[in-house]
């Protein structure tokens, strides 16, 4: 009945509603139907959120923070529905709401506890800083404070640096991990316990490939089944690192099934893509193609990074000419 938020029943006429920042929610309240309905929603027993009586809204003394953000289900009041539709919730809206309903038969009071969560999609980045390599798991806006865990080759790592910036609304969090010289696979999990939402970033380093000039190279990129759900929208990006920064070679959007290729020697196999295999070919290699190639498969729930190191060596012909 109430699709915009989920709520948990707890004792004493009190329910917990969990909403997401900037989304609409419903604070539920029901009563035994009767005539002469009076409905008063209040926040923290002090601030007037919404009043309805004598068949219409009375918002003259509504607290300004709720202006144009609240409404009732007017066609359902006579059926005992006093629920409040609440637009664009913010973290400042968290707290206890009391719904007073009076009718010709009875008066009831319901309490609803509103909790608001934020979870902007995190990202996993691979960065080179001088001679060091770092994996960084970051989330731009999250509330409450998330749980971040790292694993190396599926074994939890205790070392977990967290750089946190708090704003009025939420936290911004970076968790960097130094992976210099490592060939292990790494996994970072960020969990928002309130919203029951988990995001996972996984990084895998493939064996280095040695190729001759003018040859072509095939670089594999297949999602791990544990994370990958083909029904979910995702994006695949292939990029190459040159002098510390990545330049995008190509990307694919699952929603539109669009492929954009920025490098003419790059090719993707359409049939393989349909089988969720995003391996790529790079033709006619030259010496400047040496470097790190990164495949990034990302959705709202995961980021899968696969890194290949390619060494392009001069062909025999080129060497003998020199």
């Amino acid at each position: 009945i109430f699709p915009l938020a989920f709520f948990i029943y707890v004792p004493m006429n009190e329910q917990i509603v969990i909403g997401r920042l900037d989304e609409d929610i419903i604070l539920p309240s029901s009563f035994e139907r009767g005539s002469e309905v009076v409905i008063h929603w209040k926040y923290q027993d002090s601030y007037k959120v919404h009043s309805y009586y004598k068949g219409s809204d009375h918002l003259e003394s509504q607290d300004p923070r709720y202006a144009n953000r609240t409404s009732l289900f007017y066609n359902e009041i006579q059926n005992g529905n006093a629920s409040l539709f609440f637009r664009r919730v913010s973290l400042l809206d968290e707290g206890i709401y009391t719904c007073y309903v009076g009718t010709a038969i009875q008066v009831i009071t319901n309490k609803v506890v509103l909790k608001v969560g934020v979870f902007l999609t995190p990202v996993m980045k691979y960065e080179k800083r001088n001679t060091n390599s770092f994996l960084i798991c970051s989330v731009l806006s999250v509330y409450p404070r998330p749980i971040i865990t790292w694993k190396m080759d599926n074994t939890p790592i205790s070392e977990n640096n967290m750089e946190e910036t708090g704003s009025l609304d939420s936290f911004s969090i970076n968790s960097p991990l130094n992976i210099t010289g490592s060939n292990s696979s790494y996994e970072c999990t960020i969990e928002n316990s309130l919203l029951k939402q988990t995001w996972t970033g996984r990084w895998t380093m493939k064996d280095g490939l040695h190729k001759m000039q003018s040859e072509h190279v095939s670089l594999s990129c297949q999602p791990v089944n544990d994370y990958f759900s083909p029904n979910q929208d995702f994006k695949v990006t292939w990029s190459r690192m040159k002098s510390g920064t990545f330049s995008v070679l190509a990307y694919y959007l699952s929603s539109s099934q669009n492929t954009i290729i920025n490098e003419s020697r790059f090719s993707w196999n359409k049939e393989l893509i349909n089988q969720s295999d995003f391996s790529m070919n790079l033709m006619d290699l030259n010496l400047s193609d040496s470097g790190e190639y990164l495949c990034n498969i990302s959705s709202d729930e995961y980021t899968l990074l696969t890194i290949h190191t390619v060494h392009v060596e001069p062909s025999q012909e080129t060497a003998s000419h020199n």
């Epitope: 002469e36 008063h40 209040k42 004598k54 068949g55 009375h58 003394s61 007073y100 009076g102 008066v107």
Partner: antibody
Framework: QVQLVESGGGVVQPGRSLRLSCAAS????????IHWVRQAPGKGLEWVAV????????YYADSVRGRFTISRDNSKNTLSLQMNSLRVEDTAVYYC??????????????WGQGTLVTVSS | DIQMTQSPSTLSASVGDRVTITCRAS??????LAWYQQKPGKAPKLLIY???SLESGVPSRFSGSGSGTEFTLTISSLQPDDLATYYC?????????FGQGTKLEIK
């Protein structure tokens, strides 16, 4: 059963003050708005003031605004009407009456028996 | 303020009669009207709310009708116990106002 009992009436000189009380029982006091309604001897009924269930909203008739103050103590189930600068025309039986619900409806389901206030020099 | 005018001021009727009291508002009050009965020396008693809804415990010989500015209270068969003064009251808006009352006498 619902009971409202007024007290505090008496004879007072013009310009003086008086405080009326109303003791409520038989219902959850903090759920209901309570009104004061008065009736001058041999005359009709006149609404005086209302205080809503939680005490934050108070409304007054023009004839008493600025002179009378309505208040309540939900922990003691009592209602008060502080009457200042009394005038001869304030002479009446004062009734406390319970609203249908919060105080927002504005009609009177249960009444006390009233207390007489006489303003006379 | 909204003015409420009742008619007649006094009404004399016999037991068993059908009695009608009228109340007129100076402006539309939708159906936000109540009727009270006050017996001599007693507090008023709610009979009708929302123009036509009978309060719990009130005998069914009492009924109310009307909306906007014209309202009536009807006693279908007058009983000796109905000797009282009857008041209408608007609760559309503050200040709530009463009619001046209709005194009902039994012949």
């Amino acid at each position: 059963q619902v009971q409202l009992v007024e007290s505090g009436g008496g004879v007072v000189q013009p310009g003086r003050s008086l405080r009326l009380s109303c003791a409520a029982s038989g219902f959850t006091f903090s759920d209901y708005g309570i009104h004061w309604v008065r009736q001058a001897p041999g005359k009709g009924l006149e609404w005086v003031a209302v205080i809503w269930y939680e005490g934050s909203d108070k409304y007054y008739a023009d004839s008493v605004r600025g002179r009378f103050t309505i208040s309540r103590d939900n922990s003691k189930n009592t209602l008060s009407l502080q009457m200042n600068s009394l005038r001869v025309e304030d002479t009446a039986v004062y009734y406390c009456a319970r609203d249908r619900s919060s105080g927002a409806m504005g009609y009177f389901v249960y009444w006390g028996q009233g207390t007489l206030v006489t303003v006379s020099s | 303020d909204i003015q409420m005018t009742q008619s007649p001021s006094t009404l004399s009727a016999s037991v068993g009669d059908r009695v009608t009291i009228t109340c007129r508002a100076s402006q539309s009050i939708s159906s936000w009207l109540a009727w009270y009965q006050q017996k001599p020396g007693k507090a008023p008693k709610l009979l009708i709310y929302k123009a036509s809804s009978l309060e719990s415990g009130v005998p069914s010989r009492f009924s109310g009708s009307g909306s906007g500015t014209e309202f009536t209270l009807t006693i279908s068969s007058l009983q000796p116990d109905d000797l009282a003064t009857y008041y209408c009251q608007q609760y559309q808006s503050y200040s709530y106002t009463f009619g001046q009352g209709t005194k009902l006498e039994i012949k």
